[in-house]
């Protein structure tokens, strides 16, 4: 006979797992909020800015009560992957004006990446079905001008801020239900 089986793997407490994900999300929300304020100070926004390639906001007012954990985590992961791609694009193609937001944009990218890894881990720990690998996204066109890069930055940081606020709300509520 083969070697004796090891001790059974203790399943981590899902509430504790979710709790640390909430805290990481709140931490990223704080970073995003600070960076968006910094951007507004340097380059005041004239109204709302949109970018067609950004994900649409995952929810509206009435939807919180109906949230289920698998749906929230899957949607959040997909949206954050899109924002990660947009932040990478912004750092690469955003133009010299946005260089003034470094190293903060780099830090934001690293923390976004960390949260995505955390979500992946949480989904596997909770034995949630893993989403299929994302199809390669079409490359993002470089901004048409320096001002286009700044408008894109407003849209990306504003959208990420709302997505993270929504995520914190959803995750906090789901944690109370576990």
């Amino acid at each position: 006979p083969g070697p004796p089986p090891g001790p059974p793997r203790v399943s981590p407490d899902p509430r504790a797992e979710l709790d640390s994900t909430v805290l990481l999300t709140r931490s990223l929300l704080a970073d995003t909020r600070q960076l968006a304020a910094q951007l507004r100070d340097k380059f005041p926004a004239d109204g709302d800015h949109n970018l067609d390639s950004l994900p649409t906001l995952a929810m509206s007012a009435g939807a919180l009560g109906a949230l289920q954990l698998p749906g929230v985590l899957t949607r959040l992961r997909a949206d954050l992957l899109s924002y990660l791609r947009h932040v990478q694009w912004l750092r690469r193609a955003g133009g010299s004006s946005l260089k003034t937001l470094e190293p903060e944009l780099g830090t934001l990218q690293a923390r976004l990446d960390r949260l995505l890894r955390r979500l992946q881990l949480l989904m596997s720990r909770l034995a949630l079905p893993q989403p299929p690998p994302d199809p390669p996204a079409p490359p993002l066109a470089p901004p048409s001008s320096a001002w286009g890069g700044i408008r894109a930055a407003h849209a990306i940081l504003g959208g990420l801020h709302l997505t993270l606020d929504w995520a914190v709300r959803g995750l906090l509520l789901l944690k109370t239900r576990l």
């Epitope: 709790d19 640390s20 939807a63 919180l64 929504w166 906090l172 509520l173 109370t176």
Partner: antibody, heavy 119, light 111 residues
Framework: EVQLVQSGAEVKKPGASVKISCKAS????????MDWVKQAPGQRLEWIGD????????IYNQKFTGRATLTVDKSASTAYMELSSLRSEDTAVYYC????????????WGQGTTVTVSS | DIVLTQSPASLALSPGERATLSCRAS??????????IHWYQQKPGQAPRLLIY???NLESGVPARFSGSGSGTDFTLTISSLEEEDFATYYC?????????FGQGTKLEIK
């Protein structure tokens, strides 16, 4: 000057509802969430809930779920809290306060609205 | 819910003296590089006013005689030299989790 101005005092009968308004000025209304806090006589402050003015999506203290309803009118930079099925224990001062979910402290407060529930 | 216990319930001191107010949480409120404790001052008939956020950060416009410290479950608000206008009730609040809760308050009175 950043300000939150609340509606006036209310006297209600048990079982009735009350709706309090909170008008924000001096900052971009959608840049912060709006929280509501209860202060009953001789009791500690109690958080009721929080709403994001851009997406709505309120979250509530479980103690108030089902009785408190938070809404906003973005165009008027005004937040509302409605409390239904009033009872004597709801007699309190209710505050709106500016907050955000990242750190969740309240840096600007309304002046408070006194709600008295009495038959 | 996390319970915050403030001590003492009341404190009588004279202007110029140092005040030390305590807030103890029923579980740790420090994590991910933050201590999620905030301090407020409230005077009779007025709304609370934020003094300190995230345990030790002084809110804009608050005099430097106010300071906050602590981590984990034990936090302190210190007023280095009391002024007449500091006599009020002080509350701590945590924001570590849903729902945020407040301590029962410490009333600072003139001796």
């Amino acid at each position: 000057e950043v300000q939150l101005v609340q509606s006036g005092a209310e006297v209600k009968k048990p079982g009735a509802s009350v709706k309090i308004s909170c008008k924000a000025s001096g900052y971009t209304f959608t840049d912060y969430n709006m929280d509501w806090v209860k202060q009953a006589p001789g009791q500690r402050l109690e958080w009721i809930g929080d709403i994001n003015p851009t997406i709505g999506a309120p979250i509530y203290n479980q103690k108030f779920t089902g009785r408190a309803t938070l809404t906003v009118d973005k165009s008027a930079s005004t937040a509302y809290m409605e409390l239904s099925s009033l009872r004597s224990e709801d007699t309190a001062v209710y505050y709106c306060a500016r907050g955000e979910l990242a750190h969740w402290y309240f840096d600007v407060w309304g002046q408070g609205t006194t709600v008295t529930v009495s038959s | 819910d996390i319970v915050l216990t403030q001590s003492p319930a009341s404190l009588a001191l004279s202007p110029g003296e140092r005040a030390t107010l305590s807030c103890r949480a029923s579980k740790s409120v420090s994590t991910e590089g933050y201590s999620y404790i905030h301090w407020y001052q409230q005077k009779p008939g007025q709304a609370p006013r934020l003094l300190i956020y995230l345990a030790s950060n002084l809110e804009s416009g608050v005099p430097a005689r106010f300071s906050g410290s602590g981590s984990g479950t034990d936090f302190t608000l210190t007023i280095s030299s009391l002024e007449e206008e500091d006599f009020a009730t002080y509350y701590c609040q945590h924001s570590r989790d849903l729902p945020p809760t407040f301590g029962q308050g410490t009333k600072l009175e003139i001796k």
